[in-house]
Amino acid sequence: GSERTCCPVNWVEHERSCYWFSRSGKAWADADNYCRLEDAHLVVVTSWEEQKFVQHHIGPVNTWMGLHDQNGPWKWVDGTDYETGFKNWRPEQPDDWYGHGLGGGEDCAHFTDDGRWNDDVCQRPYRWVCETELDKASQEPPLL
């Protein structure tokens, strides 16, 4: 595969990663698919410094990140360990709230208006952030 050495047009470089900030909304799964089609993933926040960078760019708007517990435990989409990693939940979150009346609980994480995280219904059409790492060889599957 070929290595990506600079960010694509309309993406923002920061600390050897590239970020793309949507300006419209999709459900979490659709946002996840969008990032994958860009050979990227929903943003994975690994430090307070990265949190501040993303928060600065998204402003006070609900925005999906690459964290969910749709299969039980909380997981980052790129395999980053959740338990030992950076977290920035709002107080008393995540709460898997069932009181919204939309069926089920809350399985997808988003940045709230103050940047701290909340779990919410994955079908809500929030903005999202894609991330891809520079110097990472793109995995091109062999042609059969």
Partner: antibody, heavy 118, light 107 residues
């Protein structure tokens, strides 16, 4: 000039196989997600499949899942569609199309006809 | 799957007429909608993306509007080369789906 050129269509019997190709030029192929869209005779458009720029991610319409495989060779700027277990209802003109960042199809090939008949 | 319904299925109009085509989604798709023009024997051509953005090279007589579930393609003054079939496409979620098409014919 930005261009997509499909080839590989033809007449095939039900249950048979065919591989379509789409040669791209005039844009950065390796960073563009690519699609196949088909149109049965006298009918509307049906999206078939998409593949990310690296080839690492694919998605299919339910009507072709498990029978069709989308792939690409970025060294040759070429997109492929391997079609197996073909059915009469797969008869259509097959277009390759480039995806833009708003998930619309901004560049189209001229199409190649696939006829499935005994 | 998200279903897209266009109306009318065909329209007869004269050069210079204002033509409006509507597209309705059976669920909210925000602004994730595109419009295409197709002439017989040819590939579709992108006219409008993100509901209201005019594709580069497309005449300004074409415009798109709407969000949520209801969308409109307007041709402000029909030209001879505009007689064709028009399709909407939702890009909100997989599988991406098209409307059934609207044929604009000469009156």
């Amino acid at each position: 000039e930005v261009q997509l050129l499909e080839s590989g269509g033809g007449l095939v019997q039900p249950g048979g196989s065919l591989r379509l190709s789409c040669a791209a030029s005039g844009f950065t192929f390796s960073s563009s997600a690519m699609n196949w869209v088909r149109q049965a005779p006298g009918k509307g458009l049906e999206w078939v499949s998409v593949i990310s720029g690296s080839g690492g991610y694919t998605y299919y319409a339910d009507s072709v899942k498990g029978r069709f495989t989308i792939s690409r060779d970025n060294s040759k700027n070429t997109l492929y569609l391997q079609m197996n277990s073909l059915r009469a209802e797969d008869t259509a003109v097959y277009f390759c199309a480039k995806r833009n960042t708003d998930d619309a199809f901004d560049i189209w090939g001229q199409g190649t006809m696939v006829t499935v008949s005994s | 799957d998200i279903q897209m319904t266009q109306s009318p299925s065909s329209v007869s109009a004269s050069v210079g007429d204002r033509v409006t085509i509507t597209c309705r989604a059976n669920q909210d798709i925000s602004s994730w909608l595109a419009w295409y023009q197709q002439k017989p024997g040819k590939a579709p051509k992108l006219l409008i993306y993100a509901a209201s953005n005019l594709q580069s090279g497309v005449p300004s007589g074409f415009s798109g509007s709407g969000s949520g579930t209801d969308f409109t393609l307007t041709i402000s003054s029909l030209q001879p080369e505009d007689f064709a079939t028009y399709y909407c496409q939702q890009a909100n979620s997989f599988p991406w789906t098209f409307g059934q098409g609207t044929k604009v014919e000469i009156k």
